[in-house]
């Protein structure tokens, strides 16, 4: 009998370095000005290893006094990046991550960019714009998404194990056909979760089982033919 505890199928999605942004063009700014100002906070899921651009409220830069980006990351002191228009000076406080920068010169573009988003970029980002008409702010709860690595293998007769390793948030595992299943979740210190589903199929006409992993970054299915019951030689179907 071969060792069928070997990993039979694996999957890891590869993403080219993509960019995502919630910024709006000039036309949208005029159309949605009041709406955007009302929507102060936005939850924003972003795939790990992509680039992200975060935007300030759509205020014309000519009306500006000060722009401040406040960045609150887990386990770190609050970082602020400020630009004062009158003196054309920028100032940073407690900012150590070199991947979080102004998109360009803040006097030309107030947007913030994160190059190659990592799990550590999970957190709250807020742009505060001080103008003669008052203060306007826009916040982002940035949720970094991590694609789980999916594996499917057999560890004993008519029992299969499907794992979605180190996903963020936790993946959901389902099976075709449904079996007698137990699911466990393991939480890691970096915020990722490993989900492990172990199923057994007593019904002998089940030939192949399919593990379907659902995740915010995309879905993945793997299948495997079940081993025969030990000692079973012949059966008519």
């Amino acid at each position: 009998q071969p060792n069928n505890s070997l990993m039979l199928q694996t999957s890891k999605e590869n993403h080219a370095l993509a960019s995502s942004s919630l910024c709006m063009d000039e036309k949208q700014i005029t159309q949605n000005y009041s709406k955007v100002l009302a929507e102060v906070n936005t939850s924003w899921p972003v795939k790990m290893a992509t680039n992200a651009v975060l935007c300030c409220p759509p205020i014309a830069l000519r009306n500006l006094i000060i722009i401040t980006w406040e960045i609150i990351l887990r386990g770190q002191p609050s970082c602020t990046k400020a630009y004062k228009k009158e003196t054309n000076e920028t100032k940073e406080t407690n900012c150590t991550d070199e991947r979080i920068t102004w998109v360009s010169r803040p006097d030309q573009n107030s947007d913030l960019q994160i190059r190659t988003v990592a799990i550590t970029h999970d957190g709250y980002y807020r742009c505060i714009m001080v103008t003669p008409d008052g203060n306007f702010h826009r916040g982002y709860h940035l949720q970094v998404l991590v694609t789980p690595e999916v594996t499917l293998f057999q560890n004993r007769n008519r029992t299969a194990v499907c794992k979605a390793v180190a996903g963020k948030p936790a993946a959901h595992i389902s099976w075709i056909p449904e079996g007698d299943c137990a699911t466990k979740q393991e939480y890691w210190s970096n915020g990722t979760v490993t989900v492990k589903s172990t199923c057994h199929w007593e019904v002998h006409n089940v030939s192949t089982v399919t593990c379907h992993v659902s995740h915010l970054t995309g879905n993945k299915s793997l299948y495997i033919e079940l081993l025969p019951v030990p000692g079973a030689k012949k059966s008519a179907k």
Partner: antibody
């Protein structure tokens, strides 16, 4: 890359038996089920049964029960499908397939004619 | 046994057409399946494995979708070399069962 090489065409008389072979390479022969499928001229595909080379465990479609015998020779990574009491309606191309149906042999034409 | 109802059984097509073939599993039983292309005198060729995974070397105009009991195979823009018979195969339950096939013919 998995390769399945099947034996050559056969012409048989009604009532006789035929044994088709399928030699596998490129994967662990004993770790994957081997399936047999047939296709009569101008017709669709029909599953005959499967065998697990690692243990000799077999499943036959009940339509073929009593007439079909599947065996393996693990020393040569070869699977065999024998069909007995042949009749004209058994005239078909017989295929072996493995890796959950993703790798197929080229087929063996069996003609049953008096 | 799970019966696979494949439709249509034949289709008259032109180059550039969008072609859609469906397979439905009987008894409301969720299954997984493959899609094959077969040309006269040749063994079936796997195009789509596990309902939606395009096999290596298969042109991207071929696609598969669906889950549970209802599945769809699509050719986005038919090419002359796509004239063939197409089959679905459910491999979740023994006996494995094929759809009846869909034969494409040029108009």
């Amino acid at each position: 890359q998995v390769q399945l090489v099947q034996s050559g065409a056969e012409v048989k008389k009604p009532g006789a038996s035929v044994k088709v072979s399928c030699k596998a390479s490129g994967h662990t022969f004993t770790s994957y089920w081997m399936h047999w499928v047939r296709q009569a001229p101008g017709q669709g595909l029909e599953w005959i049964g499967n065998i697990y080379p690692g243990s000799g465990s077999i499943n036959y479609d009940e339509k073929f029960q009593g007439r079909v015998t599947m065996t393996v020779d693990t020393s040569t990574s070869t699977a065999y499908m024998e069909l007995s009491s042949l009749r004209s309606e058994d005239t078909a191309v017989y295929y072996c397939l493995t890796m959950t149906g993703t790798s197929w042999g080229r087929g063996t034409l069996v003609t049953v004619s008096s | 046994d799970i019966q696979m109802t494949q439709s249509p059984s034949s289709l008259s097509v032109s180059v550039g057409d969008r072609v859609t073939i469906t397979c439905q599993a009987s008894q409301g039983t969720p299954i997984n399946l493959h899609w094959f292309q077969q040309k006269p005198g040749k063994a079936p060729k796997l195009l789509i494995s596990g309902a939606s995974n395009l096999e290596d070397g298969v042109p991207s105009r071929f696609s598969g979708s669906g889950s549970g009991t209802d599945f769809t195979f699509t050719i986005s823009s038919l090419q002359p070399e796509d004239i063939a018979t197409y089959y679905c195969l459910q491999f979740t339950y023994i006996p494995w069962t094929f759809g009846q096939g869909t034969k494409l013919e040029i108009k």
